[in-house]
């Protein structure tokens, strides 16, 4: 499965804050010379979307990870390289697989 | 300790080049996004660029977009930062920071945790 | 671009009362009731040091006397009581994911 084939990370900070597993997607070579400004908040008064042109690298909760996350939204953290999950109520876990 | 040590500063001509370098040490480099912050003479802070853990991910603000580069060489826990066509108002105290982050219920919330001494760099003729 | 504005440019605050900084953003800040606004703290011939993160917590090691709080476009920074080390510039910056990321024109202190 995809615990076996991704590397989990785990994110220590601090002891009042939960910690959390990311996975990072494998990396292509030609990857590190993407750039990206593409904005992920939707704020009033946000950005249109004249900054995507340089997009490149396509989100990995779209694509590998798309069923990653079992009760929840994937998320992909650029800044990191690594895809998290937003559980829904209830949920909690490295996927949000547990109850 | 986590330590960051810049260096590469000093006087360049206008249109001139320069390449900062930023050592990285006492952490795990490849677990952190890093940025470059200036300070101009004015005391103003500035954002200059970012990478990502891996350096698949950068991000430029406007003012240095197309003559500035940012890359990390991970083997090495070292950042750089190539600028190119140096301009009169890119003189400052240049400054690598880390970006320390909490992760938590798929929310990531990022600041500026551990800051270098900075190296200077002078735009005249 | 979100744009940050810190007042006062500068105070002056007696040794043992209360300082107050204010930090307010040209648009939120917030996503999804979180604060992306953080605060440091710079002496002269030093880099700036992380006091305040995520609006209201306090960077690790640091005395309680430094409070921040807000929300949105408001965010204020609190120092008290006010001690002679704290005489230094005070700057917000706003850490949205979504670049550029910005920081305020600074708050000079000075302790009386």
């Known amino acids: 499965g995809l615990n076996d084939i991704f590397e989990a990370q785990k994110i220590e900070w601090h002891e009042s804050v939960r910690v959390e597993q990311v996975v990072k997607p494998p990396q292509n070579k030609t990857e590190s010379e993407n750039t990206s400004d593409k904005p992920k908040r939707k704020k009033k008064g946000g950005k249109n979307g004249k900054n995507r042109r340089n997009r490149k690298k396509k989100n990995p909760c779209n694509a590998e990870f798309q069923n990653f996350c079992i009760h929840g939204e994937c998320k992909y953290i650029e800044h990191l390289e690594a895809v998290t999950c937003k559980c829904q109520q209830e949920y909690f876990g490295e996927r949000c697989g547990e109850k | 300790e986590v330590q960051l040590q810049e260096s590469g500063g000093g006087l360049v001509k206008p249109g001139g080049s320069l390449k900062l370098s930023c050592a990285a040490s006492?952490?795990?480099?490849?677990?952190?996004?890093m940025s470059w912050v200036r300070q101009t003479p004015e005391k103003r802070l500035e954002w200059v660029a970012t990478?990502?853990?891996?350096?698949?991910?950068?991000y430029y603000p406007d003012s240095v977009k197309g003559r500035f580069t940012i890359s990390r060489d991970n083997a090495k826990n070292t950042l750089y930062l190539q600028m190119s066509s140096l301009r009169s108002e890119d003189t400052a105290m240049y400054y690598c920071?880390?970006?320390?982050?909490?992760?938590?219920?798929?929310?990531?919330?990022?600041?500026?945790?551990?800051w270098g001494a900075g190296t200077t760099v002078t735009v005249s003729s | 671009d979100i744009v940050l504005t810190q007042s006062p440019a500068s105070l002056a605050v007696s040794l043992g009362q209360r300082a107050t900084i204010s930090c307010k953003a040209s648009q939120s800040v917030d996503y999804d009731g979180h604060s992306f606004l953080n605060w440091y703290q710079q002496k002269p011939g030093q880099p700036p040091k992380l006091l305040i993160y995520?609006?209201?917590n306090l960077e690790s090691g640091l005395p309680a006397r430094f409070s921040g709080s807000g929300s949105g476009t408001d965010f204020t920074l609190n120092i008290h009581p006010v001690e002679e080390e704290d005489a230094a510039t005070y700057y917000c910056?706003?850490?949205?994911?979504?670049?550029?990321?910005?920081f305020g024109g600074g708050t000079k202190l000075e302790i009386k």
């Open positions: 920071a880390r970006h320390g982050y909490l992760l938590y219920d798929g929310y990531y919330e990022w600041y500026f945790d551990v």
């Open positions: 006492g952490f795990t480099f490849n677990s952190y996004a």
């Open positions: 990478i990502s853990t891996g350096g698949s991910h950068t």
């Open positions: 995520a609006a209201s």
């Open positions: 910056q706003q850490s949205t994911e979504d670049p550029p990321y910005t």
